[in-house]
C-alpha cells in the first residue's frame, strides 16, 4: 500500500497529492494508479433551514497547500485540524519491534489480499477518461455503499449540485497512471468540492496489472472568487397592500451550495433592515416579499452565503412604495 | 430524467381513511416543494397545498385546510396526501407536481391518482 | 368574484387563430405576476405550455410550437394565451394560473375546440 499519502488544493481546481512508496512491496513498483471522485455535499447541508436561530451556519475549508515535506504526516481531509508543531518522542525498542511485526504483517495480508479478495484483470488500454477496469471484481467487503456524484439535469432543477444520482464506485471514474514519481497534480476539478482520490501501488503493467490495496485519502478545491456573487439583477413587484416581491437569480455554480440569503434593506433616512432567506423559502418564492413597508424610498442589496462564506453584495435595487390607501389598485407599478 | 410516478387508483367507502403516493426521481428531492392539485369530474384544477421534503413545513389552500393531511417521507423521496375519513365529494383525480416559484410554475406533474368514494 | 376567470368555451375553425383570456380580479395587476398557461387532454395531467410576465420575460416549454404565445391586456387586467394556426390537436382544457400570495390559483379552464 502506497504510504502517507497527502492531498491539498492549491487552487480551484486542482489538487495535489504526494504519497511515499510502500515500505515492503511485492517486486518493483512499476506504476501507480489514481483514481478520484467528486463526493456529494451531505444531504443535511440541502435541508436544513440556516436562518433559524441557534443554527450555526456550515463550515468547509478547502485542503491547506503543503507547510513542508515532513511536516504533516496524516491525511488532512477537510475535517481535520492541522496538527500543532510537535516533535515526535524517540521510540522505545517495544514500538520497534511492534512497527518490524506490523510490516512482516502488512506484507502477508497484502499477499492474501492479491491473491483472494482481488482477482488480476487484463490490462485494457485506457484514455484516462475513465476506469478501464470492468473485469476488475471486488468481493463484498460491507463497507462500499451507494456513491452519489452531481449531474447536471432538466433546465427546470437548474444546479448541478441540485441533482444528485447514485453510481457504481468503479463505473466512469476518471483516473491517471503514474510512472517514476509519487505525486500527482488532479486538475479539471470543480470549485469548492470534496474529493475522494484511490490510490494503488502497481508491480506489473502488462499483461495482468497486480496493484496493491487502495489507500484513500479525501481532498476539497479551493473556492472560486466570484462564484458566489448573485449575477443578473435584482428585481421587484409591488403588490396590493405594498407588499414587494424582491427577486434574484441563484448564483449558478456555487462553492458547494448555497446556505442562504441576505437581504438588506432601508428606507431613505432610516436605519438598515437585515432578512434572512433559507434556501427553502427560496424554492418558494424565488426570492422573498417584504411585506408592512411604510410609504417612501427603498434601497436594498442582497448577497448569498455558501459553504465557503459570503458572496458579494448586489449593488443597491431601489423602489419606492406609496401609500397604498391612495391609489387605485389597476394602476401598473 | 426528472419525473414524479403516484400510486394506483383507489375505491373507498366514505369514512374509510385513505394514503396515496408521489415519488420523486432524478432530481434532488429534498430541495423543491412539492404540490397536490384536485380534480373533480368535469371540473377544473384546485390547488390543495404544498410540502417542502426537506422539513416537512407544509403549506394548505384555505379550502383544504383540515380536509386532508400532507406528508412526505423523504428517505424514499415519496410525499403522500391522506384522509382520515372520506366523503363522497372527495372523489376526484389527485395530482402532485413540483413546484418552481418562477420560471416553471407546476412542472412535471405526476400521472394522476383516481379516489373513487362510494358506498 | 373569482380571482382568475376564464371563458368556459371557446370554438374555432381550424387554421384560424384562438385567443384565451384569464382576467384577474379587480385589485390585482395583471402586470406585476407571471401567468402560466397549461394544457390537458382527457384523461392526462396537465402539461406545461408557457410563462409569460412581459414580452422580455417569457418562455415557452420544451416541444411546444411557436404558434403558441402570450400576452397582456392591461387594459382589460387579462392575461392572453394566443393560438395561431389552428390544429386539431390543439383541441384540449386550458388554464392560467398565478403565484399569489405564497399559493397556486387556477382559472376555471377553458374547453377549447378545433371544428
Known amino acids: 500500500v502506497p504510504l502517507d499519502p497527502i492531498s491539498v488544493s492549491n487552487s480551484s481546481s486542482q489538487i495535489i497529492l504526494k504519497w511515499k512508496p510502500p515500505s515492503d512491496p511485492n517486486g518493483n513498483i512499476t506504476h501507480y494508479l489514481v483514481f478520484w471522485e467528486r463526493q456529494a455535499e451531505d444531504s443535511e447541508l440541502f435541508e436544513l433551514d440556516y436562518c433559524l436561530k441557534g443554527l450555526k451556519l456550515p463550515s468547509r475549508t478547502w485542503s491547506p497547500p503543503f507547510e513542508s515535506e515532513d511536516s504533516q504526516k496524516h491525511n488532512q481531509s477537510e475535517y481535520e485540524d492541522s496538527a500543532g508543531e510537535c516533535c515526535s518522542c524517540p521510540k522505545t525498542d517495544s514500538q520497534i519491534l511492534k512497527e518490524l511485526e506490523e510490516s512482516s504483517f502488512r506484507k502477508t495480508f497484502e499477499d492474501y489480499l492479491h491473491n483472494v479478495v482481488f482477482v488480476p484483470r487484463k490490462t485494457s488500454s485506457g484514455t484516462g477518461a475513465e476506469d478501464p477496469r470492468p473485469s476488475r471484481k471486488r468481493r463484498s467487503l460491507g463497507d462500499v455503499g451507494n456513491v452519489t456524484v452531481a449531474v447536471p439535469t432538466v433546465a427546470a432543477f437548474p444546479n448541478t449540485s441540485s441533482t444528485s444520482v447514485p453510481t457504481s464506485p468503479e463505473e466512469h471514474r476518471p483516473f491517471e497512471k503514474v510512472v517514476n514519481k509519487e505525486s500527482l497534480v488532479i486538475s479539471g476539478l470543480r470549485h469548492f468540492t470534496g474529493y475522494r482520490i484511490e490510490l494503488q501501488a502497481c508491480n506489473q503493467d502488462t499483461p495482468e496489472e497486480r496493484c496493491s490495496v487502495a489507500a484513500y485519502v479525501s481532498a476539497r478545491t479551493m473556492p472560486e472568487a466570484k462564484a458566489d456573487d448573485i449575477v443578473g439583477p435584482v428585481t421587484h413587484e409591488i403588490f396590493e397592500n405594498n407588499v414587494v416581491h424582491l427577486m434574484w437569480q441563484e448564483p449558478k455554480e456555487p462553492n458547494g451550495l448555497i446556505v442562504l440569503y441576505e437581504v438588506s434593506y432601508r428606507r431613505y433616512g432610516d436605519e438598515e433592515l437585515h432578512l434572512c432567506v433559507s434556501r427553502k423559502h427560496f424554492a418558494l418564492e424565488r426570492g422573498c416579499r417584504l411585506r408592512g413597508l411604510s410609504p417612501g424610498n427603498y434601497s436594498v442589496r442582497i448577497r448569498a452565503t455558501s459553504l465557503a462564506g459570503n458572496g458579494s453584495w448586489t449593488e443597491p435595487t431601489y423602489f419606492y412604495v406609496t401609500d397604498y390607501l391612495d391609489v387605485p389598485s389597476n394602476i401598473a407599478k | 430524467e426528472v419525473q414524479l410516478v403516484q400510486s394506483g387508483a383507489e375505491v373507498k367507502k366514505p369514512g374509510e381513511s385513505l394514503k396515496i403516493s408521489c415519488k420523486g426521481s432524478g432530481y434532488r428531492f429534498t430541495s423543491y416543494w412539492i404540490g397536490w392539485v384536485r380534480q373533480m369530474p368535469g371540473r377544473g384544477l384546485e390547488w390543495m397545498g404544498i410540502?417542502?421534503?426537506?422539513?416537512?413545513?407544509?403549506r394548505y389552500s384555505p379550502s383544504f385546510q383540515g380536509q386532508v393531511t400532507i406528508s412526505v417521507d423523504k428517505s424514499i423521496s415519496t410525499a403522500y396526501l391522506q384522509w382520515s375519513s372520506l366523503k363522497a365529494s372527495d372523489t376526484a383525480m389527485y395530482y402532485c407536481a413540483t413546484h418552481h416559484a418562477s420560471g416553471r410554475g407546476l412542472d412535471p406533474w405526476g400521472q394522476g391518482t383516481l379516489v373513487t368514494v362510494s358506498s | 368574484q373569482a380571482m382568475l376567470t376564464q371563458p368556459a368555451s371557446l370554438s374555432a375553425s381550424p387554421g384560424a387563430s384562438a385567443s384565451l383570456t384569464c382576467t384577474l380580479r379587480s385589485g390585482i395587476n395583471v402586470v406585476a405576476y407571471n401567468i402560466y398557461w397549461y394544457r390537458q387532454k382527457s384523461g392526462s395531467p396537465p402539461q406545461s405550455v408557457l410563462r409569460?410576465?412581459?414580452?422580455?420575460?417569457?418562455?415557452?416549454d420544451s416541444g411546444v410550437p411557436s404558434r403558441f404565445s402570450g400576452s397582456k391586456d392591461v387594459s382589460a387586467n387579462a392575461g392572453i394565451l394566443l393560438i395561431s394556426g389552428l390544429q386539431s390537436e390543439d383541441e384540449a382544457d386550458y388554464y392560467c394560473l398565478i403565484w399569489h400570495n405564497s399559493a397556486w390559483v387556477f382559472g376555471g379552464g377553458t374547453q377549447l375546440t378545433v371544428l
Open positions: 409569460y410576465k412581459s414580452d422580455s420575460d417569457s418562455e415557452r
Open positions: 410540502i417542502y421534503p426537506g422539513d416537512s413545513d407544509t
